[in-house]
């Protein structure tokens, strides 16, 4: 009986450990600044790091600029987007800016895209100021199904701060779907 | 056998409960306004409450102004920083401000400090306005090792809002490292 | 013995699954714009969706404009509040605004209300500009007891963005109280 109990304990420990880790996908993706689009229109950001510096991914997939869900569950999603401009890098096209982020979910089965979270601000960035900076943070708790894709759109991509501590987004699974 | 089963169930319940709680360190630290530095330069904030009001800590350590990780894991880190100025508290040294927060990680083994998250905004706080306020929120998911330290730096510390609901930072463990 | 072991495994699997799901209440509530108060004073927002679009709730209760905790625990709370104004919707009463959010906790046992988190900004929304936008995000980790209520107060409710991706708040349980 003791041997059986040990076996129960052992197998349970494995199962618990394994299931716990398997049950918790996550990603933290940081901007890849070598490929940021120009212009001031709203664009989907497709270049992100997933395996250097703070960037990491587990039990999720990064493909074609989208974070793909591999496991059904409730996830906490977040994004931090920093915009900046220094006069030494050129002029602003306009001093009145709409600096925005949109975190969207795309379902492949039903080809449709929906915004989960948005944030930002209209700003007056005077051409007379040497330096401008503004950050947006959004976060929320969402049900995601395997195969669904998360992407990030921003306005004025040419103003993005390319640092890994500045412009990033991520997700981590909190619980299963009942 | 029933006794053995009860023993298995009982020990497992204890183990599950214990391991679950042990596996989830957290901290929510609120600003200690009795010791906020003056000036407008970037400074590390070292005075935080960990055991009064909303402030709390478990399975992490607060020492020398830093939040110390005691347990390897993936953590969600966050900070909320509020800046404010009322004309009754005197004039601003300058109307053009850079209000910023930097959440940094320091590794003792390899003495180095790296910024995990940053946020903020450049602001024009006109002397003609009676009151000014601005808040920053940042959050992200990071791998932390035992012994690593989390600290918060801000610009213009003299403008910090000293309320516990305004200026705080924290962390909670989400999962183990594989 | 094998039968007993199967019974142990089976009951454990049920228990683990059941306890895991039961241990993780959550809510994501989105603004119900059909009933937003007018004016510029600080008001408690009482109309939220809990079961349409992104809005959902489990093991928590939404009643009388408040999110009620049904299970003791440590929760991560968050709110995202967007304000906007377009000139086509009329003039602003004042160009100098204080756009704020307060996430509060009310204890029924001891009838008192306390602010857990606040954020926002003073803004100058010039009448010369066609469109204005501003978002606030706050988040933090708090101990909540069964029966406690979470509510959201904002200034200038008439300026709230009514989209479900714009104005929302939520909570999810991270761990039990020791």
């Amino acid at each position: 009986i003791r041997a059986e109990k040990a076996m129960v304990d052992g197998s349970w420990l494995d199962l618990a450990k394994r299931s716990k880790l398997e049950a918790q996908p996550f990603a933290h993706l940081t901007i890849n600044a070598t490929n940021i689009p120009t212009g001031s229109h709203k664009v989907s950001l497709s270049s992100w790091y997933h395996d250097r510096g703070w960037a990491k991914i587990s039990n999720m997939t990064f493909s074609n600029g989208k974070l793909i869900v591999n496991q059904d569950g409730f996830y906490y999603l977040y994004a931090n987007i920093c915009f900046r401009h220094h006069e030494t890098s050129g002029d602003l096209a306009t001093e009145y800016l709409q600096l925005m982020v949109y975190v969207t979910k795309t379902s492949i089965k039903i080809p449709s895209s929906h915004t989960l979270m948005k944030g930002g601000s209209t700003k007056y960035w005077s051409g007379n100021s040497e330096f401008h900076f503004y950050s947006i943070n959004v976060g929320g708790f969402f049900k995601l199904r395997s195969g669904e894709e998360i992407s990030v759109e921003v306005s004025n991509p040419s103003l993005l701060d390319p640092d890994q501590d500045a412009t990033y987004f991520g997700a981590f699974k909190v619980r299963d779907i009942d | 056998i029933r006794a053995e089963k009860a023993m298995v169930d009982g020990s497992w319940l204890d183990l599950a409960k214990r391991s679950k709680l042990e596996a989830q360190p957290f901290a929510h630290l609120t600003i200690n306004a009795t010791n906020i530095p003056t000036g407008s330069h970037k400074v590390s904030l070292s005075s935080w409450y960990h055991d009064r009001g909303w402030a709390k800590i478990s399975n992490m350590t607060f020492s020398n102004g830093k939040l110390i990780v005691n347990q390897d894991g993936f953590y969600y880190l966050y900070a909320n920083i509020c800046f404010r100025h009322h004309e009754t508290s005197g004039d601003l040294a300058t109307e053009y401000l850079q209000l910023m927060v930097y959440v940094t990680k320091t590794s003792i083994k390899i003495p180095s400090s790296h910024t995990l998250m940053k946020g903020g905004s450049t602001k024009y706080w006109s002397g003609n306005s009676e009151f000014h306020f601005y808040s920053i929120n940042v959050g992200g998911f990071f791998k932390l090792r035992s012994g690593e330290e989390i600290s918060v730096e801000v610009s213009n510390p003299s403008l910090l809002d000293p309320d516990q609901d305004a200026t705080y930072f924290g962390a909670f463990k989400v999962r183990d490292i594989d | 013995i094998r039968a007993e072991k199967a019974m142990v495994d089976g009951s454990w699997l049920d228990l683990a699954k059941r306890s895991k799901l039961e241990a993780q209440p959550f809510a994501h509530l989105t603004i119900n714009a059909t009933n937003i108060p007018t004016g510029s004073h600080k008001v408690s927002l009482s109309s939220w969706y809990h079961d349409r679009g992104w809005a959902k709730i489990s093991n928590m209760t939404f009643s009388n404009g408040k999110l009620i905790v049904n299970q003791d625990g440590f929760y991560y709370l968050y709110a995202n509040i967007c304000f906007r104004h377009h000139e086509t919707s009329g003039d602003l009463a004042t160009e100098y605004l204080q756009l704020m959010v307060y996430v509060t906790k009310t204890s029924i046992k001891i009838p008192s209300s306390h602010t857990l988190m606040k954020g926002g900004s003073t803004k100058y929304w010039s009448g010369n500009s066609e469109f204005h936008f501003y978002s606030i995000n706050v988040g933090g980790f708090f101990k909540l007891r069964s029966g406690e209520e979470i509510s959201v107060e904002v200034s200038n409710p008439s300026l709230l963005d009514p989209d479900q991706d714009a104005t929302y708040f939520g909570a999810f349980k991270v761990r039990d109280i020791d």
């Epitope: 050129g90 096209a93 007379n128 | 024009y124 | -």
Partner: antibody
Framework: QVQLQQSGAELASPGASVKLSCKTS????????LQWVKQRPGQGLEWIGA????????KYTQKFKDKATLTADKSASTAYMQLSSLTSEDSAVYYC???????????WGQGTLVTVSA | NIVLTQSPASLAVSLGQRATISCRAS??????????MHWYQQRPGQPPTLLIY???NLESGVPARFSGSGSRTDFTLTIDPVEADDAATYYC?????????FGGGTKLEIK
Amino acid sequence: QVQLQQSGAELASPGASVKLSCKTSGYTFTTYWLQWVKQRPGQGLEWIGAIYPGPGNTKYTQKFKDKATLTADKSASTAYMQLSSLTSEDSAVYYCARRGSRRGIAYWGQGTLVTVSA
Amino acid sequence: NIVLTQSPASLAVSLGQRATISCRASESVDSYGRSFMHWYQQRPGQPPTLLIYLASNLESGVPARFSGSGSRTDFTLTIDPVEADDAATYYCQQDNEDPYTFGGGTKLEIK
């Protein structure tokens, strides 16, 4: 290094139009306002206006609004100024110019002389 | 439009002496903690060259004999000591506000 190369001198009849060009190199054409300045013989400098080549935004001094039209060809990194309904008052040297990295007009084209004569 | 008035219209200065040129703006050209006033030198048949930017900053490659000062509405360009090569016309310019404007110019002659 930043260079602004302007087109050659123009001789035009009153009432006609001319289109001056300014070919840029050594920097990202779409990220700076490209300015135009007029100088009549023996006179001072007058700011005409500027174009932001990315989206093609323009700004003008009031007196030149009906006189000058600023355009840009992003693919050729070239800015243009068309002067219409020419009169003798439009006889001048026209400069294209760009600000320095820290303000002030640090970069100038060599100038294009426009002569309006019957 | 901001009007810039330069004085004197012309001046003659002996070699090695100090030359001072004034520029007065019809309204302040200060914003964001800086003065948006610049100084240029122009020799006949040449485009202008930037000497001083933001009221007091010496442009790269410009001799330290040139200096600028002032704020809000009153600005000064100083050349000390003057050299023969400095004979030219000097212009002030503001870019604090559209449309940008130039002063009428000051012609410097070396005696």
